[in-house]
Amino acid sequence: IFLSAFFTYVPMNEQIIIGRLGEDIILPSSFERGSEVVIHWKYQDSYNSYNVHSYYKGSGRLESQDTRYANRTSLFYNEIQNGNASLFFRRLSLLDEGIYTCYVGTAIQAITNKVVLKVGVFLTPMMKYEKRNTNSFLICNVLSVYPRPIITWKMDNTPISENNMQETGSLGPFSINSTLNITGSNSSYECTIENSLLKQTWTGRWTMKDGLHKMQSEHVSLSCELVNDYFSPNQDFKVTWSRMESGISSILAYYLSSSQNTTFYESRFSWNKELKNQSDFSMNLTDLSLSDSGEYLCNISSDEYTLLTIHTVHVEPSQETASDN
């Protein structure tokens, strides 16, 4: 009777914690300081309750810990006396998603804290431009994502439907390819992949420039600029210039913003301007020959964006060459 007069039970409160696959997380739980602290963390699914971590009589008690949590959980033992019952959780897997309940008892109080753990993953997606026979395709691809993302395609800023979507990984994480047939189009296209749990998005943008007609031995300038609504000066990105030929892409130049290093794989290729402001990556190709006709692709990519710019170059025989023939 004496005890019950001073013993209080605090009802359950709940919070949502979002973690990333493979990373560590803290499931928070606090209580009013007291003596004779007992802590039990449990995981509840539709059918059973599993012991995650226990503490009583001044030390961690793992005899009844479920094997899935072995070597993956710990408490902040030196902070328990200050009312910290939070659980440190290592190497999250998708199977760890669910409801965790922390029961804390002291000599004067019992509390229950509920934590809903959600786990997400979002590996950097990419946008690819492919030619198959006479058809052109844009592919937005994400290798590992959870939960299932929202994929948005836009043509000239208006949403459109994708042509084909392939998904693997029935329970997650998912690998997704979303394809759009853009044969014969000179519109601009955008693909956005959105993980609403992790509050992360990635956008790929594709732009086809007007065809360039040049004479043999002339030079051509191929434009490629960062658009002002995308990249910021402090963002790491890479720029790749390549040439598409018979469905195969060969790299002509490569630039890394972090090191500000450029590698040229074609001696006739050079930057139009000094890369001082790191926003204009236009290229010059000199001494054109007939075999330089084709599609040139500028790819600017960061963790958040891919910008693809396509140029079609037509090189025609010069007058002298034509008259020689």
């Epitope: 948005t152 208006t158 439907s161 509050k199």
Partner: antibody, heavy 119, light 111 residues
């Protein structure tokens, strides 16, 4: 936790300008967009536009193009909206709201700044 | 601009029953994969709170009694079973093209 703290109520005269602020905390300011939304007393919501704090790129609803100007200060994680040539029609609650990059819905909102335009 | 019309303008629903709110757009705002319609709840003196994005995706932390559906021009927000704390005004919003617009709101009262 994510919070958008807006500046206090404003009382302004017709023809004047006001600048209200929206201070973000609990997330990386430059990784999201800040939208501004207007709500007149007893009426619905109107989207004014957004700013990308990372690059200072702005997009406006045509209706507000000559009325609103967005700026952002990355160092203080604060977005601003200036409203000019005020009339009684501008009396409203103005909200800032966070949006994911490339997604046009609003997952966190400020508490609102009440603007009263009166002579 | 795309006009969103919500109906009814107000409704009263008994505790524990279902509330259904409709939002009709003046043109289609969906593709074969996504509905570009989002739903918010606003209580008096508070800012709106996101409930559902892309027609049917529940925002993290929102109770499962809220659900959304629809495509094309017709979208629906369902609340079942309604709770006393659901007394609020509900707004739909599209993100199809600029400018993004909101519906006029539906005021829900719990009996």
């Amino acid at each position: 936790q994510v919070q958008l703290q807006q500046s206090g109520a404003e009382l302004a005269k017709p023809g004047a300008s006001v600048k209200m602020s929206c201070k973000a905390s609990g997330y990386t300011f430059t990784s999201f967009w800040i939208h501004w939304i207007k709500q007149r007393p007893g009426q619905g919501l109107e989207w004014i536009g957004y700013i990308i704090p990372n690059t200072d790129y702005t997009e406006y609803n045509q209706k507000f193009k000559d009325k609103a100007t967005f700026t952002a200060d990355k160092s203080s994680s604060t977005a601003y909206m200036q409203l000019s040539s005020l009339t009684s029609e501008d009396s409203a609650v103005f909200y800032c709201a966070r949006g994911l990059r490339g997604a046009y819905y609003f997952d966190y909102w400020g508490q609102g700044t009440t603007l009263t335009v009166s002579s | 601009d795309i006009v969103l019309t919500q109906s009814p303008a107000s409704l009263a629903v008994s505790l524990g029953l279902r509330a259904t709110i409709s939002c009709r757009s003046s043109q289609s705002v969906s593709t074969s994969t996504n509905g570009y319609m989002h739903w918010y709840q606003q209580k008096p003196g508070q800012p709106p709170k996101l409930l559902i994005m892309y027609a049917s995706n529940l925002e993290s932390g929102v109770p499962a009694r809220f659900s959304g559906s629809g495509s094309g021009t017709d979208f629906t927000l369902n609340i079942h079973p309604v709770d006393e704390e659901d007394t609020a005004t509900y707004y739909c919003q599209h993100s199809w093209v600029l400018p993004y617009t909101f519906g006029g709101g539906t005021k829900l009262e719990i009996k």
